[in-house]
Amino acid sequence: SQVSQNCHNGSYEISVLMMGNSAFAEPLKNLEDAVNEGLEIVRGRLQNAGLNVTVNATFMYSDGLIHNSGDCRSSTCEGLDLLRKISNAQRMGCVLIGPSCTYSTFQMYLDTELSYPMISAGSFGLSCDYKETLTRLMSPARKLMYFLVNFWKTNDLPFKTYSWSTSYVYKNGTETEDCFWYLNALEASVSYFSHELGFKVVLRQDKEFQDILMDHNRKSNVIIMCGGPEFLYKLKGDRAVAEDIVIILVDLFNDQYFEDNVTAPDYMKNVLVLTLSPGNSLLNSSFSRNLSPTKRDFALAYLNGILLFGHMLKIFLENGENITTPKFAHAFRNLTFEGYDGPVTLDDWGDVDSTMVLLYTSVDTKKYKVLLTYDTHVNKTYPVDMSPTFTWKNSKLPNDITGRGPQHHHHHH
């Protein structure tokens, strides 16, 4: 039903859903701090633009008795319950920030007349792609898929002279919310990734993964998995690995690789880590002081959600346009705004663009080094290290299928 919005006459409210089920196990207090810090910045920016208006946030907490698992897999109805609560209280802001779980976002989007914008720190799954009033401020699965396909096909770099068309995907069902949806997208038979690969098999058991590492009859040398180095070590341990195996470890929201004193453990030498380029200023910020490197991105997405709203509010107010219109609801895309940590770009569908970084372990220094970067906005790979000190033969990435012979540049059309 249509709920009146507290969103006019110089007073603009943001509804922040504080859900028990969340993409990352972040104390709600930290998210509140991030939102409040964002509000301070927005107020300052509006004031500097000569706009004398009030911007506030209302935090909507769900009933912990009903939704207390903290697990996104059980979150389908929580968002709807919160919306009902908002509806009953007749308290809807100009914009909805949260939810972060794919299930609840999808359900809310399906079951409500969304005449207001929805900003999510999460909602990683493909089912939340191409939603007209949904903005996602953490890299969704679609962006990962496009990188992987781009990288698989690349065959003209000094360190990658074969295009690949095969892969194993390790997915055992215990993954974090981001990994769950990333791997889900790679597994889906109708996804772009599956469509572009000739062979893809999902490994679901630890033993399956462990056996592949030395199996002479394996169908691919490439294994994709998602998580941190510790997750890989628990699975792989110090087992021997065939020399032409390449493990791609997707670990987007983890800054630990970029700490100065980090040395790569020995078990990472056959691994390429895909992560996001680290921000510049976050380490000293007041809201992130208590956050682990993994959680920083989640709280930052809440903060940036507030800044995005402030950006759009400023534009609409300066143009004398109404905020409670479908035009406003559909405007949160195809733009760049000043985020907390520098410019943030949203694509045509409201999904954040970013620079992904592929790291390798130098056999000389045992340090992580950047192999290449990938710009999700233009779907392009930029090599950085033209002569990497790889563990692989001739310091080049192997073919994805052993014994394929000299099919040096097999192209896919």
């Epitope: 970029f258 100065d260 380029s277 680290p278 970084v357 130098s362 000389d364 220094t365 340090k367 992580y368 080094k369 950047v370 192999l371 970067t373 930029y382 950085v384 290290d385």
Partner: nanobody, 123 residues
Framework: EVQLVESGGGLVQPGGSLRLSCATS????????IGWFRQAPGKEREGVIC???????KYADSVKGRFTISRDNSKNTLYLQMNSLRAEDTAVYYC?????????????????WGQGTMVTVSS
Amino acid sequence: EVQLVESGGGLVQPGGSLRLSCATSGFTLDDYAIGWFRQAPGKEREGVICLTSGGLPKYADSVKGRFTISRDNSKNTLYLQMNSLRAEDTAVYYCAASGATSRWNCPPQYDHWGQGTMVTVSS
């Protein structure tokens, strides 16, 4: 002795591309952060790109999406690939190096500088 020698400058039309090289000697690239700077006639020198010793590129907003940096340790050389060049990119381009105190951050200042190479973007 640390040395940096730039090359690859020249005259190019708007929308065109150039690749600048910075040949280095006297140090290991892995231990140094490298920056590309430029100075347009009558203007102050400005940072364009820095590559941290860990290999993380950091771009000035004015060149993001157009310029990219790479390095080849086997040749002790850094490259600045410049695409979609504009008239305002006309400048002398300098390569600079600094012993890295952090693997992932650009240094506040650089100790060693090359002589520069001129890039002119004009039709």
